[in-house]
Amino acid sequence: VAKKKDKVKKGGPGSECAEWAWGPCTPSSKDCGVGFREGTCGAQTQRIRCRVPCNWKKEFGADCKYKFENWGACDGGTGTKVRQGTLKKARYNAQCQETIRVTKPCTPKTKAKAKAKKGKGKD
C-alpha cells in the first residue's frame, strides 16, 4: 500500500468542489485498525481518519463486495455448511476473486438433523 501524504491541500476561499472521489480506508499499520482515507477533487486532496474493523478479512472488506447465495445444507461429515459469493463490486485497483466460497460451522441443531438424516440413510 502506497503511503499517503500527510499534508492536506485545501482550495482557497473562492474554490468550489462539487464531487470528491474518496479512496479506500488504508490502515496505518498492518491490515486493519485506524488509518486514513484520501479524497481528491480537481487539484485538491484531503485525508480523513477512518477505521478498518479487525474482524474483517481483507478480501471481504471494502475492497471486494460479494453477492452471496443461501447457505447450503449442513455436511454431517465435516460439521460445516458452505455458500458461494459472486463478485458484485471491487475497488478499482483491488484484485478480487470472481467467486469465493465461505464455510461456517453448523449450529448444534442443524448438526443433529444432518446426523439423523445420515443415520436414516444407512438403514
Partner: antibody, heavy 117, light 107 residues
Framework: QVQLQQPGAELVRPGHSVKLSCKAS????????MNWVRQRPGQGLEWIGM????????ILNQKFKDKATLTVDISSNTAYMQLSSPTSEDSAVYFC??????????WGQGTTLTVSS | EIVLTQSPATLSLSPGERANLSCRAS??????LHWYQQKPHQAPRLLIK???QSISGIPARFSGSGPGTDFNLTISSVEPEDFAVYYC?????????FGGGTKLEIK
Amino acid sequence: QVQLQQPGAELVRPGHSVKLSCKASGQSFSSYWMNWVRQRPGQGLEWIGMIHPSDSETILNQKFKDKATLTVDISSNTAYMQLSSPTSEDSAVYFCSSWSAKRGDFWGQGTTLTVSS
Amino acid sequence: EIVLTQSPATLSLSPGERANLSCRASESISNNLHWYQQKPHQAPRLLIKYASQSISGIPARFSGSGPGTDFNLTISSVEPEDFAVYYCQQSNSWPLTFGGGTKLEIK
C-alpha cells in the same frame, strides 16, 4: 470473456446532444467498472470517466463534467454516454472498456463521432 | 492531476532489437501503472498491468518494471507486429491519465 459492441459511427449536428452506447455480452457486465475514453484524430487517449453498473457510482474527469453523462441499463447490459451540446471539438473516436484489476480489461472497437452540420 | 511523461516520443528499431520505453509520473503512483499497445484504427490492447503483472495472451517478450515514479516497458526482441504506439496509464488517483505515447517504428 467480455465482448463490448459499439456502433461504428455516429453523425450529430452541432448543439444536438448524442447518446453513445456500449453493449456487453459474455461474462458478468455488472461486476466491473466501465470506462469511457476519447481519442481525437491523430491524438492520444483521454479518460472521460467511469461508472459501476452495480450501483451506478460514477467518477467523472472534471474536464468533462459539463459535457458527459454516464448511465447504465442493467436489463440490456448496456452502458451509455451522453454528450451535451457537441461542437466540432467533440469529433473523435469514443471507446468503452470494462476493467477488472484481476483479469485486465476488454475494449469496444470505438464509435467515430462526427459533429457536423 | 498526475502527469505521465513518455520517452522517447519515437523509437526507431529493427526487428530483433531490444526496445526500452519509459514512463515517468509527476508523483509516486505506487505500482498503479499500466501499459497499452495501439495500432491504427484499433482499440488499445492491455500489455502489462500494475507495473509488472503479465496479461493472459500477451507474448512473454513484453515485460514491465516499477513501482514509484519511473516505469519501463521492455520488448526483449521486437517482432514486426510490435510496431505501434505504446501508452502508459495510471490508476492511482482520479482522473485516470495517459502518457502522450511512444511510437515504435521500423528503422
